[in-house]
Interface confidence: medium
């Protein structure tokens, strides 16, 4: 549960997390886990700890082994492991696959790509991304932060994506890779003017005075990831925020995809302890996206309760 | 600034058992390990054990195991011990304190006193 | 566990003057990574103990640059440089190397 396996290459630099969490306050001990001998905090040495992070600048292949790490709070040591293993540098392009950091998967309209491990770095932008060993180059790749941005996404662009940065510690750099494999799904989405599928419009609602009502609000916007889409409800034309009875509130649903792929919404209106006055309101359910709104209209009426002695 | 305030003076029975409550204000609740530590004037101070209100962990010193149970409700930032099977040698002031990981016992309640006695 | 010795009483000291508390420990509180895990705390009279030193070494915050703490592994020596009247009470060492913590005896510091 506490162990981590963490991977680099030879010359590069290398910085591993203690998979045991602490406070930043926390005094954070390494070893060394076969000879149980202390990891120096020294950053003179090559390889030294860091409060939660262990450092290798640069890594060199025998440094690949298991490192512990023990968290040590007021009272209580916490102890994680780190599984590092160090390679050599591959003359040929290709990646092997224990070099891969997690695949990701992107679409027309999503398909950013993390550097993975970045954050663990002190490195400044811009990032270099590269595909498949060819640098990318072009105006339909931007790198941003910590991330590469492909624009208009087709099958092709899938495939192995390296990034490269700087690390530095102390004025000195040292050079990172890191590589990951971007899928693309093939998502043919669209969008079309809303439709709502319940309420009905001009439904009645048979409420019991008192009692708890729920109205649900749910429409379809189309296949697909949708860039805006909304469901809500208004009373009397009034948004529920500013309409001001604390007893009326709104309470987003699940977003659904149901099985033909339609990206759909709920809102459900909850009526606490419904009065006579709730009868008098007009209930809208709205839908909108960018190709327009749809309205439909409830109104509720009062439900005879059972007469339990008839 | 951090402060411990804990219950009243308590006089009970042998054999009964007593809960102690410790509230924390001034802080976050659970960025410190809450420490319970008995003073008698026989044996002077005595670490009891701690909790950590984040984990939910415990930690004990052996001559206290069965004897106190620590716990803590987030909610109301209030930490208890509760000691079973009094007896006259439970007769002391406890007190809780809060430790970082450099601050060890830095912040200490008042102290409740209690007397067991038939 | 860990035994923390001091003796029960100081020698009376002179307002102004300066003041020695020791603390001897059964075994080394120095750990691998470099702490060495020695508390110093006060109990003024009716009072809770308060938090002077951390660290063997360390000065509490709020705590006045009058006491000093030093020592090897286990032989450890709290010193007051000019002691005022509010010093008074008993010092307390305690060790937070390993579970069970443990606290000394205290050694009471009076006043000529």
């Known amino acids: 549960k506490f162990s981590k396996q963490s991977w680099g290459l030879e010359n590069e630099a290398l910085i591993v997390r203690c998979p045991r969490q602490g406070k930043p306050s926390y005094t954070v001990d390494w070893y060394y886990s076969q000879t149980n001998k202390s990891i120096p905090t020294q950053e003179r040495n090559r390889v030294f700890a860091s409060g939660q992070l262990l450092k290798f600048l640069p890594a060199a292949v025998a440094d690949s082994g298991i490192y512990t790490c023990i968290v040590r709070s007021p009272t209580f040591n916490r102890t994680g492991y780190a599984n590092v293993t160090i390679y050599k540098k591959q003359s040929d392009c290709n990646v092997p696959d224990y070099l891969m950091y997690s695949t990701v998967s992107g679409s027309e309209k999503n398909s950013k790509i993390y550097c993975p491990t970045i954050d663990l770095y002190n490195w400044t932008a811009p990032l270099e991304w590269f595909k498949n060993c060819q640098a990318l180059q072009g105006s339909r790749y931007r790198a941003h932060k910590s991330f590469l941005v492909i624009d208009n996404v087709m099958t092709e662009d899938a495939g192995d994506y390296t990034c490269k940065f700087i690390h530095n510690e102390n004025g000195a750099n040292y050079s990172v890779t890191a590589t990951r494999s971007f899928t693309v799904k093939d998502e043919q989405g669209f969008s079309l003017f809303p439709v709502i599928g319940a309420p009905a419009q001009n439904e009645i609602k048979e409420v019991e005075i008192g009692k708890n009502a729920n109205l649900t609000c749910s429409a379809c916007f189309g296949k697909g990831t949708q860039f805006l889409a909304a469901v809500l409800w208004q009373l009397n034309g009034t948004k529920i925020t500013d309409f001001g009875e604390p007893r009326i509130q709104q309470e987003e649903g699940q977003n659904q995809s149901f099985s033909n792929g339609l990206a759909c919404l709920d809102m459900v209106l909850r009526i606490a302890d419904v009065k006579e006055e709730d009868l008098l309101l007009q209930y809208d359910c709205l839908a909108l996206n960018l190709h327009g709104l749809r309205r439909h209209t409830v109104r509720l009426s009062r439900k005879n309760p059972i007469d339990h002695h008839s | 600034q951090v402060q411990l305030q804990q219950s009243g003076a308590e006089l009970v029975r042998p054999g009964a058992s007593v809960t102690l409550s410790c509230k924390a204000s001034g802080h976050i609740f659970t960025d410190y390990e809450m420490q319970w530590v008995k003073q008698t004037p026989v044996h002077g101070l005595e670490w009891i054990g701690a909790?950590?209100?984040?984990?939910?962990?415990?930690a004990y010193n052996q001559k206290f195991k069965g004897k106190a149970t620590l716990t803590a409700d987030k909610s109301s930032s209030t930490a208890y011990m509760e000691l079973s099977s009094l007896t006259s040698e439970d007769s002391a002031v406890y007190y809780c304190?809060?430790?970082?990981?450099?601050?060890?016992?830095?912040?200490w309640g008042q102290g409740t006193s209690l007397t067991v006695s038939s | 566990d860990v035994v923390m010795t001091q003796t029960a009483f100081s020698n009376p000291v002179t307002l102004g003057t300066s003041a020695s508390i020791s603390c001897r420990s059964s075994k080394s509180l120095l750990h691998s990574n470099g702490i060495i895990y020695l508390y110093w705390y006060l109990q003024k009279p009716g009072q809770s103990p308060q938090l002077l030193i951390y660290?063997?070494?360390n000065l509490a915050s709020g705590v006045p640059d009058r006491f000093s703490s030093s020592g090897s592994g286990t032989d450890f020596t709290l010193r007051i440089s000019r002691v005022e009247a509010e010093d008074v009470g008993v010092y307390y060492c305690a060790q937070n190397l390993e579970l069970p913590f443990t606290f000394g005896s205290g050694t009471k510091l009076e006043i000529k």
């Open positions: 660290q063997m070494s």
């Open positions: 304190s809060g430790s970082t990981t450099d601050y060890y016992f830095a912040y």
């Open positions: 909790f950590d209100p984040e984990t939910g962990d415990t």
